[in-house]
């Protein structure tokens, strides 16, 4: 069955019981989703608004699915498997009487049950298993997944070490004058440019030596950190951003909502599952996007791909490629390519390499 | 790819029966839920029937309740739907329909098949 | 029981306007709303999913929006090959389906 392909997942509580306190609601879904992150790679974080990955309702009877619920007793919530829309999502009926004891139904234990599922997990034939498929109480400060449980999410999603396996592990701030530092992402923001990295991202203001660190989360909250590819049109106040197979859209520094999309509305083949590095010209008012060692050409006026892409890179980009990390223009005719710890930066009038630089050279290293 | 490619439609008389098959390829069958929709001449669409990836559960719509059958052999890689004691009002094109994976159907159909043409008169 | 009403039933526009379907639930069913494109004589095509996630292969001029019980279908610059008609959609109910034609 499916499982979600990335470490980093998010939740949403859509709306609130009336038989607990918020705190309360907000305490037992934290730590039904800490029992599995603590016994796998994955990390759970809570978003207010924004599309998240698991989203978790309170509903009665028909909802919005085919699965309406049954008044109180007999089903006590469900859950969807991995996946986008209503994948992941869980649903807890209103006509129970949710609690943080033993009267009632206890939230904490029937959303450790429910989560297990949004994380791919099917019923247990162990009466001792979480994931067995009825209710029952247990002491919940001594609650314990069974051998069976771990057995069963670990066969998904490994073990918690295999974080370690993941490049800088800790999220720790990269060091800015490190030799070796690549970007993830580079796009201008009007004079600013915006340096991304993990969870990170460095402000560079034109012409001045200081630069800022900051978390991704702390000015867009609803984003993703490892930002892959990001382009600027100006004209517009517009910054489009890439994770995997989709993109947000900032406008005058706000996400816009209905967002993330899917990269295949700009008209990439199904075989396109992440953008490598963006930028939008604005003299063609063209946005380049580089895939792997391909490259293809998107008309923003039409909103479509131009005919006769994709391109190689090495071919019509003198010196660059076969793969680029970042790339953003500037200047009103260079595009600065990074690749690794390297820069080029690149007239595209001339269709030349005019300069080699570090990555990190617009910090005064 | 992704392939659904329904059969078994044709003119029946009322209160016959047919059996309408859907040959699924391009994915892993057993994993999905799957579905009939129909659409009668000129009208819009309605949800017919679905059937869990393991055939465990079953559903269907009031109109069809009792009289047909939903049913799928995941070794063939095919859905069929089981109609019986037809009435004029079945007469539709009906689609096959694939789902999300997963214990729980999201009514979400992102494949549909070409659809066969079912009409029931005398 | 759930049901939806979609408006307009019908809507001529020509190519370059801007157009807006809208879906509407007699209660809330949160953001699991889809929206389907059909063309005479062919199957539906899933273009937006989860009220406001564009399908894959989808063109960028198509977007969704709304949750609870109000959702609208925008397409932003219509297209020649946008005349068809529209249907909103949630588990087991289909709205009755909007016909885009030409002005």
């Known amino acids: 069955g499916p499982v979600w392909r990335k470490h980093y997942i998010t939740y949403r509580i859509n709306n609130y019981t009336p038989d607990m306190n918020r705190e309360d609601v907000d305490y037992a879904i934290r730590k039904a989703f800490q029992v599995w992150s603590n016994v796998t790679p994955l990390k759970f974080s809570k978003i207010n608004t924004g599309m998240a990955d698991i989203l978790v309702v309170f509903a009665r009877g028909a909802h919005g699915d085919f699965h309406a619920f049954d008044g109180k007793g007999g089903i006590l919530a469900h859950a969807f498997g991995p996946g986008s829309g209503i994948g992941g999502d869980a649903h807890f009926d209103e006509d129970e009487f949710w609690t943080t004891h033993s009267g009632g139904t206890n939230l904490f234990l029937t959303a450790v049950h429910e989560i297990g599922h949004s994380l791919g997990l099917g019923h247990s034939s162990d009466p001792k298993a979480v994931m067995f498929p009825t209710y029952k109480y247990v002491d919940i400060n001594t609650f314990r997944l069974s051998a069976d449980d771990i057995r069963g999410i670990q066969s998904l999603y490994g073990d918690p070490k295999e974080n370690q396996r993941l490049p800088n592990p800790d999220n720790s701030e990269p060091a800015l004058c490190d030799p070796n530092l690549s970007f993830d992402a580079v796009t201008t923001v009007g004079n600013k440019i915006f340096f991304f990295k993990d969870r990170f991202f460095w402000l560079k203001v034109s012409e001045r030596p200081k630069t800022s660190v900051n978390l991704i989360s702390s000015l867009w909250p609803t984003l993703p950190s490892g930002i892959e590819a990001a382009y600027e049109i100006e004209a517009r106040n517009q910054v489009f951003l890439f994770k995997d197979d989709k993109y947000w859209l900032i406008s005058n520094l706000r996400p816009e909502p209905n967002y993330p999309k899917s990269i295949h509305s700009f008209g990439f083949p199904n075989f396109v599952k992440k953008i490598d590095a963006a930028v939008f010209n604005p003299r063609f008012y063209r946005t380049y996007f580089f895939v792997d060692n391909q490259y293809w050409r998107y008309d923003e006026r039409r909103q479509m791909m131009d005919p006769g892409y994709p391109k190689l890179i090495t071919k019509n980009f003198q010196g660059i490629g076969p793969k680029i990390d970042a790339v953003f223009y500037s200047k009103n005719k260079y595009y600065y390519f990074f690749q690794g710890s390297n820069q080029f930066e690149y007239d595209f009038l001339l269709q030349r390499i005019t300069k080699t630089l570090k990555s990190n050279s617009w910090f005064g290293c | 790819e992704v392939q659904l490619l329904e059969s078994g439609g044709g003119l029946v008389q009322p209160g016959g029966s047919l059996r309408l098959s859907c040959a699924a390829s391009?994915?892993?069958?057993?994993?999905?839920?799957m579905h009939w929709v129909r659409q009668a001449p000129g009208k819009g669409l309605e949800w017919v029937s679905g059937i869990s990836p393991s055939g465990g559960m079953t559903m269907y719509a009031d109109s069809v309740k009792g009289r047909f059958t939903i049913s799928r052999d995941n070794s063939k890689n095919t859905l069929y739907l089981q109609m019986n004691s037809l009435r004029a009002e079945d007469t539709a094109v009906y689609y096959c329909?694939?789902?999300?994976?997963?214990?729980?159907?999201?009514?979400?159909?992102?494949?549909w098949g070409r659809g066969t043409l079912v009409t029931v008169s005398s | 029981d759930i049901q939806m009403t979609q408006s307009p039933s019908s809507l001529s526009a020509s190519v370059g306007d801007r157009v807006t379907i809208t879906c509407r639930a007699n209660?809330?069913?949160?953001?699991?709303l889809n929206w389907y494109q059909q063309k005479p004589g062919k199957a539906p095509e899933l273009l937006i999913y989860a009220a406001s996630s564009l399908q894959s292969g989808v063109p960028s001029r198509f977007s969704g929006s709304g949750s609870g019980t109000d959702f609208t279908l925008t397409i932003s610059s219509l297209q020649p090959e946008d005349f068809a008609t529209y249907y909103c959609?949630?588990?087991?109910?289909f709205g009755q389906g909007t016909k885009l034609e030409i002005k």
């Open positions: 209660q809330s069913i949160y953001t699991y």
């Open positions: 329909a694939r789902d999300i994976v997963g214990p729980y159907s999201a009514g979400l159909f992102d494949y």
């Open positions: 959609q949630q588990a087991g109910i």
């Open positions: 391009g994915f892993t069958f057993s994993w999905y839920w």
